[in-house]
């Protein structure tokens, strides 16, 4: 994840020593503010090569974050500069010091130098985490197409602040488990992969914890695929219709089509007597095929005005992509006027590869 | 590298019609979709409507809701809009654009993203 | 509709300025929120997407913030060739709106 999305007026520069080895530091710093973490080394001897990492990826330097081997500054600091960092031995990996960074909205005021304070006092009592809109995270299930974005968001709060972590299938899940990274935004509790492939599908669980409990909620992704299909019409449609002799008819036929479809409407007819030719393709007349004016919408309905007995019969909705055909069909039974109207059965639905 | 080229703009009389095309390439229409967006001269951008392949569904502006129809054929990867009953505010450049979506866990609801342009097309109604 | 208001409508600005815009929407549209850039004559330009995440291969110089109904994108440190037409636009209601543009000019 890329430092900084958000540049603000810069305010105080508020530096903070760090903390013994072990020890996680809480901090608050307004937006705006220039965050500087040290790092001394331990016991003062020589430190050898560092790193500076932000939630489990290393920090890139930049015009903004500056990287120093016992020093980090992150300039017009935003929400999204919120989060866990540590120092490590380059080497070793061995965690010299530990942070826990919160960018608030306000500005900060410049009392609080440090911003412990307000890391552990927010105004209400101390309690555990909790859900603060437990309403809005019902969907428990995520099936999207690949190559789209997925945002999974878990948004709480609790007093010390919470902190946030994730894991995918009970693991721990960091950026660099997956090619192109993850995106976390602490201040939104929300864990974002962009482009989704087949290999991200599986549980997601986000961690919310403070030092008076912890709480979690797991998601599911599904990474669905798409193959070429020929047009999928909709179950029931066209429906039969049962109308009186001079009124008017209407069939509704949907189609589903990746590919662009072509959509025409035919009547089955007798031709000699027989309604299948030799070969048993059955004899048809095209009612209504797409025009130069036509849209796909004009075509999926078929208006018959002023019916009459001839009128009767089968009708076909017969869509076509460059995969296949698809077809559904539906019966017009035509009464005398006097007669009451009878509903006829449902439609039955025939598919051609 | 992600392209989109629109082609069929021109001049055309109000009432008449117009079908303009989206060629992409560089990626499939099978997951994501294509919006299209419009401007008139001087003006700023108006959105016209979506396609989303995954569906097949479409999503329409109510100024064109009934005149314009947007669809796609995803083995020639292009995208279309059929711009029927036109008329003189319909006059603008056209733009196609890739669209994602971000499928968001929160009150479920997706995010649709325009990543990629094309170049536009201008579209001039008048007598 | 969702309504999307900008403002200032124009502004002039000299290189190295840091420039704030913002945009108000009518109502609530969480982080559903994107910025563009244009330029006169070309299409536009994505820049942020979901109200805060810097679109990939976008100066870091340009960062969005806000959720809501107040949104901003700032320019830490205005270049030359961001001297355009930047819009906001919303998807989380339906349609899908733009603001009406900020017109970055040279001071």
């Known amino acids: 994840e890329s430092l900084g999305t958000e540049q603000r007026v810069v305010g105080r520069a508020a530096e903070v020593p760090g903390p013994e080895p072990g020890q996680q530091e809480q901090l608050v710093f307004g937006s705006g503010d220039a965050v500087e973490l040290s790092c001394p080394p331990p016991g003062g001897g020589p430190m050898g090569p560092t790193v500076w990492v932000k939630d489990g990826t290393g920090l890139v330097p930049s015009e903004r974050v500056l990287v120093g081997p016992q020093r980090l500054q992150v300039l017009n600091a935003s929400h999204e500069d919120s989060g866990a960092y540590s120092c490590r031995q380059r080497l070793t990996q061995r965690v010299l010091c530990h942070f826990s960074v919160r960018v608030t909205d306000a500005p900060s005021s410049g009392d609080d130098e440090d911003g412990e304070d307000e890391a552990e006092d927010t105004g209400v009592d101390t309690g555990a985490p909790y859900w603060t809109r437990p309403e809005r995270m019902d969907k428990k299930l995520l099936a999207v197409p690949a190559a789209n974005t997925v945002r999974f968001r878990c948004p709480a709060a609790g007093n010390p602040t919470p902190s946030i972590s994730w894991l995918k299938n009970g693991r721990e899940f960091r950026g660099e488990h997956r090619i192109g990274g993850i995106k976390l935004r602490h201040q939104q509790w929300s864990l974002v992969m962009e482009s989704v492939v087949p290999s991200d599908r599986g549980n997601y669980t986000c961690v919310v914890e403070n030092k008076f409990g912890s709480i979690r909620q797991t998601y599911t992704l599904d990474v669905l695929e798409r193959s070429p299909h020929r047009p999928i019409l909709q179950a029931g449609l066209p429906a039969n219709q049962t109308a009186v002799l001079g009124s008017d008819v209407e069939f509704h036929c949907k189609v589903y089509s990746d590919a662009q479809p072509h959509i025409q409407w035919l009547k089955h007819v007798e031709v000699n007597g027989s309604k299948v030719g030799p070969d048993g393709t059955p004899y048809v007349t095209v009612l209504k095929t797409a025009g130069a004016n036509t849209t796909d919408k004009e075509l999926e309905v078929l208006s018959l005005h002023n019916v009459t007995f001839e009128d009767a019969g089968e009708y076909t909705c017969l869509a076509g992509n460059s995969i296949g055909f698809s077809h559904h069909s539906a019966w017009l039974v035509v009464l005398p006027a006097e007669e009451e109207l009878v509903e006829a059965d449902e439609a039955g639905s025939v598919y051609a590869g | 590298e992600v392209q989109l080229v629109e082609s069929g703009g021109g001049l055309v009389q109000p009432g008449g019609s117009l079908r303009l095309s989206c060629a992409a390439s560089?990626?499939?229409?099978?997951?994501?979709?294509i919006s299209w967006v419009r401007q008139a001269p001087g003006k700023g951008l108006e959105w016209v409507g979506r396609?989303?392949?995954?569906?097949?569904?479409?999503n329409y502006a109510d100024s064109v809701k009934g005149r314009f129809t947007i669809s796609a054929d995803t083995s020639k990867n292009t995208a279309y809009l059929q711009m029927n009953s036109l008329r003189a505010e319909d006059t603008a450049v056209y733009y196609c654009?890739?669209?994602?979506?971000?499928?968001?866990?929160?009150?479920?609801?997706?995010?649709?993203?325009?990543?990629?342009w094309g170049q536009g097309t201008l579209v001039t109604v008048s007598s | 509709d969702i309504q999307m208001t900008q403002s200032p409508s124009s502004l002039s600005a000299s290189v190295g300025d840091r420039v704030t815009i913002t945009c108000r929407a009518s109502?609530?549209?969480?982080?559903?929120l994107a910025w563009y850039k244009q330029k006169p004559g070309k299409a536009p330009k994505l820049l942020i997407y979901?109200?805060?995440f810097l679109y990939s291969g976008v100066p870091s110089r340009f960062s969005g913030s806000g959720s809501g109904t107040d949104f901003t994108l700032t320019i830490s440190s205005l270049q030359p060739e961001d001297f355009a037409t930047y819009y906001c636009?919303?998807?989380?209601?339906?349609?899908?709106?733009f603001g009406q543009g900020t017109k970055v000019e040279i001071k």
């Open positions: 636009q919303q998807s989380t209601g339906h349609p899908q709106t």
């Open positions: 560089g990626f499939t229409f099978t997951s994501t979709g």
């Open positions: 654009a890739r669209t994602y979506g971000i499928y968001d866990t929160y009150d479920n609801y997706t995010e649709y993203v325009m990543d990629y």
């Open positions: 979901s109200a805060s």
């Open positions: 396609y989303w392949a995954w569906d097949g569904s479409t």
């Open positions: 109502q609530d549209v969480d982080t559903s």
